[in-house]
């Protein structure tokens, strides 16, 4: 198949990587079929330099990532190792809360306003970061 | 200046499959996602599934999964539609559609048509 | 699914009129949505997108609002070629679904 070589219009590249920035809001399981969508996956945060590029262009907004633990495990997207990776969780977090009265616990993350994780509820409305890497061929097994 | 053809349609029994094919030009067709959406004679607007730019990823209605399988070839431009196990209930005019991508980046589906192609299933 | 309403199912109406048209969502869809113009033996046309952002060159006569659940689709001063079927879709999650549709017809 194809590889992407470039960044599509309005994605800011980044080592080797396309980032879109949401400016509005989606549950967790919609944000992460809009990226899909577009060929891509919620962002997946590997390094701290990551973890800072990200957190600059999102800003102090509370914005889903393509980390959640739904079916047990935490776990990335796009199959990152969770438990050898790297995590910037909040103190105290995840905490998988059932204070909140939605029903259930909290079983994706997203970057607070400070820029570390919390998990969440999954249907909450927040902002997202689709990610796709370059130099990655395009016809690739279908994620779903 | 954007122009999608559907064809393949006609009259199939029920059970049996049809396959229906959308060319497109005046787009680069690669960069968008693209759907179906079909109308029974006289009803409203029912949307049947997506698929993205490179074909990784596709979305279906309930109605049809297992049963329609929506493909495209890039190097063609061309957008498919296999239809098995069909039913009277899929008798409609099916329509090829792209989206549009605002000055975000944001991509909204469903921004431009085609003329449609009417599938009849009858014994 | 998230369920789609519109509301009047259809309307008679004369030129020069307002009209509106209501569709409500059976869950909170963001500005998830747009508005079609359809006319007999014809492909739907975007006139709305984004609940409120008017499609590149349709009269500025067509105006959309609202947000959440409940939106609007308003003609100004209606027009001959306005007559025609108007349907909601909802772009906030799979399955996409689309409104019932109303029908607007010469009074």
């Known amino acids: 198949g194809s590889e992407r070589t470039c960044c599509p219009v309005n994605w800011v590249e980044h080592e080797r990587s396309c980032y879109w920035f949401s400016r509005s809001g989606k549950a967790w399981a919609d944000a992460d079929n809009y990226c899909r969508l577009e060929d891509a996956h919620l962002v997946v945060v590997t390094s701290w330099e990551e973890q800072k590029f990200v957190q600059h262009h999102i800003g102090p907004v509370n914005t889903w990532m393509g980390l959640h633990d739904q079916n047990g495990p935490w776990k990335w997207v796009d199959g990152t190792d969770y438990e050898t990776g790297f995590k910037n969780w909040r103190p105290e977090q995840p905490d998988d809360w059932y204070g909140h009265g939605l029903g259930g616990g909290e079983d994706c993350a997203h970057f607070t306003d400070d820029g570390r994780w919390n998990d969440d509820v999954c249907q909450r409305p927040y902002r997202w970061v689709c990610e796709t890497e370059l130099d990655k061929a395009s016809q690739e097994p279908p994620l779903l | 200046e954007v122009q999608l053809l559907e064809s393949g349609g006609g009259l199939v029994q029920p059970g049996g499959s049809r396959r229906l094919s959308c060319e497109a030009s005046g787009f680069t067709f690669s960069s968008y996602a693209m759907s179906w959406v079909r109308q029974a004679p006289g009803k409203g607007l029912e949307w049947v599934s997506v698929?993205?730019?490179?074909?990784?990823?596709?979305y279906y209605v309930d109605s049809v999964k297992g049963r329609f399988t929506i493909s495209r070839d890039n190097s063609k431009n061309t957008l498919n539609l296999q239809m098995n196990s069909l039913r009277a209930e899929d008798s409609a005019v099916y329509y090829c559609t792209k989206g549009y991508y605002d000055s975000s980046g944001y991509y909204y589906p469903f921004d431009f048509w085609g003329q449609g192609t009417l599938v009849t299933v009858s014994s | 699914d998230i369920q789609m309403t519109q509301s009047p199912s259809s309307l008679s109406a004369s030129v020069g009129d307002r009209v509106t048209i209501t569709c409500r969502a059976s869950?909170?869809?963001?500005?998830?949505l747009g508005w079609y113009q359809q006319k007999p033996g014809k492909a739907p046309k975007r006139l709305i997108y984004a609940a409120s952002s008017l499609q590149s060159g349709v009269p500025s006569r067509f105006s959309g609002s609202g947000s959440g659940t409940e939106f609007t689709l308003t003609i100004n001063s209606l027009q001959p070629e306005d007559f025609a079927t108007y349907y909601c879709?909802?772009?906030?999650?799979?399955?996409?679904?689309f409104g019932p549709g109303t029908k607007v017809d010469i009074k």
């Open positions: 879709l909802q772009l906030n999650s799979y399955p996409f679904t």
């Open positions: 698929i993205s730019g490179s074909g990784s990823n596709t």
């Open positions: 869950q909170d869809i963001s500005n998830d």
